[in-house]
Amino acid sequence: KSSNEATNITPKHNMKAFLDELKAENIKKFLYNFTQIPHLAGTEQNFQLAKQIQSQWKEFGLDSVELAHYDVLLSYPNKTHPNYISIINEDGNEIFNTSLFEPPPPGYENVSDIVPPFSAFSPQGMPEGDLVYVNYARTEDFFKLERDMKINCSGKIVIARYGKVFRGNKVKNAQLAGAKGVILYSDPADYFAPGVKSYPDGWNLPGGGVQRGNILNLNGAGDPLTPGYPANEYAYRRGIAEAVGLPSIPVHPIGYYDAQKLLEKMGGSAPPDSSWRGSLKVPYNVGPGFTGNFSTQKVKMHIHSTNEVTRIYNVIGTLRGAVEPDRYVILGGHRDSWVFGGIDPQSGAAVVHEIVRSFGTLKKEGWRPRRTILFASWDAEEFGLLGSTEWAEENSRLLQERGVAYINADSSIEGNYTLRVDCTPLMYSLVHNLTKELKSPDEGFEGKSLYESWTKKSPSPEFSGMPRISKLGSGNDFEVFFQRLGIASGRARYTKNWETNKFSGYPLYHSVYETYELVEKFYDPMFKYHLTVAQVRGGMVFELANSIVLPFDCRDYAVVLRKYADKIYSISMKHPQEMKTYSVSFDSLFSAVKNFTEIASKFSERLQDFDKSNPIVLRMMNDQLMFLERAFIDPLGLPDRPFYRHVIYAPSSHNKYAGESFPGIYDALFDIESKVDPSKAWGEVKRQIYVAAFTVQAAAETLSEVA
């Protein structure tokens, strides 16, 4: 059979039928259903939701839906011994205590099992000492404190505001600075947008609201006790002392009412500049310690959380491909939430549910995709991307041979201004072409394409008339597929206007106030942005699974490789004397990029001309496209980060959420002027240039004519 016969209807009609079947009202209904009680990883409630989703996906028409369980390290507060922070006087009496829970939102007062705010995987401890305010606790903040201000954090408890970077990086930085405890808080400057009311009257964070979250530094390892291998029934588990990525000092999050009480007494050094000041009515003094009258008072942390090996459940649904069943396109998003998960993750899970329903409807009418589509509802994402990583570890041999693409589906919205896409360059053209075919949901863009509104509101900084598409970083379930396995990946959601809203993420992120009502009242009453995200995510999956030639353009990789080579060369050139002394040349890298560009161009020409009716040649060309992302994987991984194996992209060593290009070279160059052995440091730069140049050249050769 020809590929079109096998899939029954013409490709264009298939896509239209699939998109037309997606309904905003269904997404709304699913979101409501998924958000009425908490679904914390490792709990009975989340297991029940897994079984419900399994049952519904079967009803929707998938060929099979299975639960995949793992026993992984999770972290919970002690129910009888709550976590809190005190100010103590010289006699050790507690004269102020932070709140033990968030005031529940209206209508949820009687809901049980709302986990109080905590920093997951914090060790137990009751450190006491002077406070030091460390701004966002970024690498550059500690440089400012230690190098410029000569403030020593050793033996101090540091207080840092949330935002800018992943919280785990903050904790790592504090540990390296010698701190004995970390207090994380949400400053209104970052989590309270001007002119908007706090929940329940608006979408801003109230003073008693607190952001939960894990504070691990896993670097892609998955379950801390079984790095590299699935946490199955016969797993060998490391001892807790050898576990990957656990913090070594107590950590606890608080809201801005409680933060005010701690920060208002701060003495010591004034903030170095205005970028260290938030919006509270406090001086933002750095410390150490409290001012004058309060100088004998100290801060004490009381942390009693426990780490426990707990069973988690992924739901894996399969829609078998008609022509290439051994080629997998994966749509995955997590199911576990910190509390109700109104945005994170259920706004994404509801969209996945509707996408599954639409695919199932087409399948019931006799259609099948060309390639197999796998749908995943991941567990324990909030505890370190554990469900997705364990499943990928268990199935790594299949995935590395058969994985075409992974599309992530966490929160569908973090605002309602415009589209946001992060993906491999291989998917740029797919995203452009798809968004040109979709209608914009934005006010003022009636009858215009999504591409047009997106490009207008979020223009590319490099190419006029094109929208911004960002690098993939981490902090979500695509990590193992892209950074470890080299499977082409992408993600899409609706976002805020970054120009006018400088707060980090969305204000109610990971708080008890992330409810169904938050979405329905304030973010997307008509669920039109959710529907658009469903069309983008679903449309990408459809095209990846159904187009005869994979919708990847290798020429777009060539363009970004040149851009990234220029960027890293320019960073290195900040040290011209050392480059000359140590004979550092980027010639091999530029040469490899030039070769890649030429070979990619020739491959694209052959792709236009080859005989698509010859299934062997078609499969050969598609395999070259599928395996291109894989060719950027270095089996040895990045220095000290063995599970980050992609040579072109990795999560930033200073912020897990951000992507860094040529990360090996970048890290070798970072702060190189402070290295004690410059010869060794510049030797490592040269080694990383060699690795990058070799990898780009090797990837280019996978696109050459095979014989």
Epitope: M573, H575, P576, M579, K580, S583, V584, S585, D587, L589
Partner: nanobody, 120 residues
Framework: QLQLQESGPGLVKPSETLSLTCTVS????????YYWGWIRQPPGKGLEWI?????????YYNPSLKSRVTISVDTSKNQFSLKLSSVTAADTAVYNC????????????RGQGTLVTVSS
């Protein structure tokens, strides 16, 4: 023998744009083996690379100056130019144009330099 010569005003007012031109003689600017760059040395400080350009007009800029720098090339005149906008006193320095091997920091020829003072 290759020679490079900087030209341009020695005094620039704060917030204005510094403009310098480098004329290359004794050799062609149109070589793919070399980049043409600008470097500077503020009084009492180390050498700082500003940016470079190749004969085709492809530019590389110091990330910390990128938003303010423009380097352009005119192969017909065997010249390349530097523009640095929104200058402050911190931009006071001796500015040199130089040639370096492509993809390296091997500066083999440079002009004698011109002092540019930023002051009102």
């Amino acid at each position: 023998q290759l020679q490079l010569q900087e030209s341009g005003p020695g005094l620039v007012k704060p917030s204005e744009t510094l403009s310098l031109t480098c004329t290359v003689s004794g050799g062609s600017i149109s070589s793919s083996s070399y980049y043409w760059g600008w470097i500077r040395q503020p009084p009492g400080k180390g050498l700082e690379w500003i940016g470079s350009i190749d004969y085709s007009g492809y530019t590389y800029y110091n990330p910390s100056l990128k938003s303010r720098v423009t380097i352009s090339v005119d192969t017909s005149k065997n010249q390349f130019s530097l523009k640095l906008s929104s200058v402050t006193a911190a931009d006071t320095a001796v500015y040199n144009c130089a040639r370096h091997k492509a993809a390296t920091a091997d500066f083999d020829y440079r002009g004698q330099g011109t002092l540019v003072t930023v002051s009102s």
